[in-house]
Every structure is written in structure tokens, then in C-alpha cells.
């Protein structure tokens, strides 16, 4: 069946060194356990995180994300997942694409991450 992929409507903000969560879901909600679900970074499709065959797959994960990502899938039975990125870097800033794919259909959603320096303070006027 067909579905839409829905990500955050506004840019998500994170501080360097912190962790950040990027939510993504399908609508109408359905069990995504048997789907291929992932995040990649356009324009070169570098794999941030990939889930298939009921488990996380790190075979194609970009080196800069190795050991820094976790897919929160407690609600994957309802088509809801969240990507957690630990130890956020300035290089993480920019676009991410989340996709859900089953055997007959695929959709994706774009989202943006803004990374800020925790030590940069603007003094009050």
C-alpha cells in the first residue's frame, strides 16, 4: 500500500558535542519492521543509518557516522522511528533524507539539522 513519509517541518537545532534526534514516520501508520528504512545525506547518498531485515545494517554506513548513530524503533510497528546522532559535529549540519521502502513502494522526506557552537555567546545589548 502507499504511504507518505513525514519528518520535522522545521530545522532541528543541536549543539556541537551533544546528541540530536531526527524523527520520521509514515502516514497512515503501518508496521515497518519488514521495510528498508534509512537516512542518507544528499547529494551523494552517503549512508547515515540503515535498517533492513529487522535489524540495523552498518555495511554501507559512511565512516563519519560509524558508532555515532542509533535507530530508536520502539514504535516501528506503527511506522515511527527516530535517528539519534551522538557527539554532533559541525560537519553534520545540513540536509538529511529519511526514507521508507517496502516491496512495492518508496517515499522519503527531507529534513535539516542546524549545528551551533555551545561556546559562542552573544552578549546582551
Amino acid at each position: 500500500g502507499q504511504f507518505r513519509v513525514i519528518g520535522p517541518r522545521h530545522p532541528i537545532r543541536a549543539l556541537v558535542g551533544d546528541e540530536v534526534e531526527l524523527p520520521c514516520r509514515i502516514s497512515p501508520g503501518k508496521n515497518a519492521t519488514g521495510m528498508e528504512v534509512g537516512w542518507y545525506r544528499p547529494p551523494f547518498s552517503r549512508v547515515v543509518h540503515l535498517y533492513r531485515n529487522g535489524k540495523d545494517q552498518d555495511g554501507d554506513q559512511a565512516p563519519e557516522y560509524r558508532g555515532r548513530t542509533e535507530l530508536l524503533k520502539d514504535a516501528i510497528g506503527e511506522g515511527k522511528v527516530t535517528l539519534r546522532i551522538r557527539n554532533v559535529r559541525f560537519s553534520d549540519e545540513g540536509g538529511f533524507t529519511c526514507f521508507f521502502r517496502d516491496h512495492s513502494y518508496q517515499e522519503e522526506a527531507a529534513m535539516e539539522l542546524k549545528v551551533e557552537d555551545p561556546f559562542y555567546w552573544v552578549s546582551p545589548g
Epitope: 528498508e36 534509512g38 551523494f44 547518498s45 554501507d60 516491496h103
Partner: antibody
């Protein structure tokens, strides 16, 4: 309608090279991993190689690793298999197959008609 | 590598028969298994994926079952068009795949 059309097969001597092509149409080519699967005369199916939708990741069977190279040109909707150091045991019909996944190897929902590669002196 | 073993290698049956083909994996592959039909001189055709999901356009007389290491393809009432060779394929491995050796269903 999804169509996959292989070409480039033929007779080649042992140690020789051949380049197979697969022209794809009827689907968003760059969104799907693609594979080559071969079938020796009178034998079963053997997966040979695969490539991710973007072309950034490639995968090979041990029997062809180091001799065969898979690639794709998403601007031309075409899949390739460069075969070097060919052996008699590489003789087979080579099928191009569309996967349902973007990365890695899954099941194949569309296949081409195949192209015959014969390695013989 | 995961090995796939099909049985029987050849099966003789008549139109209307219920036919069952078995596929065993050398290690657990959960439900990540596909079945294909191939006729002489033609490309394989996907019938079943994820062990039991029927591919779009495939007649409902075909069904798949099983999980772990043992799987079956069943044709509830064999039709003239079903005489062919059937292959199972494990899709559990992320970066490779393997097929069974095939089961030829021939006319008794």
C-alpha cells in the same frame, strides 16, 4: 512498464574481457540497487554482483571478486558488468535484475531476458 | 556463506495436484526468503518474498510458509502453466545472496 535489456554477450577466449550492459526503463533507475545473476547451461542461478542505487556501494560473489567490476550510469539508466580474466566456468547466461532495496542485496522483482557469455578457445 | 538446499530436485505431478517444495537454510534466516519460477529459455519470475508475501500479479494458488531454517512453497492446485523450475533465495545476508539448486516440476 519495467524493462531491462542486456547486451554485450558473445564468445571470448579464456583470459579475455567482455563488458555487459543493461538498459533500464519504466522505473526510477537511481532509486534501486541492481544485480547481475548468471546461469550456466543446464545449471541453477548464481548471484554475481550488485550495486546500490547511487552507485556508491558495490558487492561481489567470491567467485568473481577481483575479476569483475559492476558500475552504473544513472544519467543513462544503464548498468554495466566489466568482466576480465574470463574462465571457462564463467560461461553462462547473464541476467540483469532490479532489486527492491536501495542498498545491499534483496529479492529481484524484475529481470532482463539475459545475454549469453561463452568462454572457450 | 549461507547454503540453501531444495528438495526434491525433481517432482512429477499432475494437473490439479497439491505440490510442496522444501527449502532449507544452513543457518537461521528468519523470514528473509524469496521464491522464483523459471521456464526454459526465460528469465526467473518472483513469486513470493519475505517467506510468505505474494508478489503482485501472482496467482493465489501459490503460497509460502516457514521461518528460521525450513521453508515451503505450495501450489494448491497445479495448473498446466506451473510446470517449471522453482528456486528459493535467501535475502538475509545484507551484501550477498544465495539460491537453492532448483526443483523441476514435471508432468507425471
Amino acid at each position: 512498464e519495467v524493462q531491462l535489456l542486456e547486451s554485450g554477450g558473445g564468445l571470448v577466449q579464456p583470459g579475455g574481457s567482455l563488458r555487459l550492459s543493461c538498459a533500464a526503463s519504466g522505473f526510477t533507475f537511481s532509486s534501486y540497487a541492481m544485480s547481475w545473476v548468471r546461469q550456466a547451461p543446464g545449471k541453477g542461478l548464481e548471484w554475481v554482483s550488485a550495486i546500490s542505487g547511487s552507485g556508491g556501494s558495490t558487492y561481489y560473489a567470491d567467485s568473481v571478486k577481483g575479476r569483475f567490476t559492476i558500475s552504473r550510469d544513472n544519467s543513462k539508466n544503464t548498468l554495466y558488468l566489466q568482466m576480465n580474466s574470463l574462465r571457462a566456468e564463467d560461461t553462462a547466461v547473464y541476467y540483469c535484475a532490479k532489486d527492491w532495496v536501495y542498498f545491499g542485496v534483496g529479492s529481484f522483482d524484475y529481470w532482463g531476458q539475459g545475454t549469453l557469455v561463452t568462454v572457450s578457445s | 556463506d549461507i547454503q540453501m538446499t531444495q528438495s526434491p530436485s525433481t517432482l512429477s505431478a499432475s494437473v490439479g495436484d497439491r505440490v510442496t517444495i522444501t527449502c532449507r537454510a544452513s543457518q537461521s534466516i528468519s523470514s528473509w526468503l524469496a521464491w522464483y519460477q523459471q521456464k526454459p529459455g526465460k528469465a526467473p519470475k518472483l513469486l513470493i518474498y519475505d517467506a510468505s508475501s505474494l508478489e503482485s500479479g501472482v496467482p493465489s494458488r501459490f503460497s509460502g510458509s516457514g521461518s528460521g531454517t525450513e521453508f515451503t512453497l505450495t501450489i494448491s492446485s497445479l495448473q498446466p502453466d506451473d510446470f517449471a523450475t522453482y528456486y528459493c533465495q535467501q535475502t538475509h545476508s545484507y551484501s550477498s545472496t544465495t539460491f537453492g539448486q532448483g526443483t523441476k516440476v514435471e508432468i507425471k
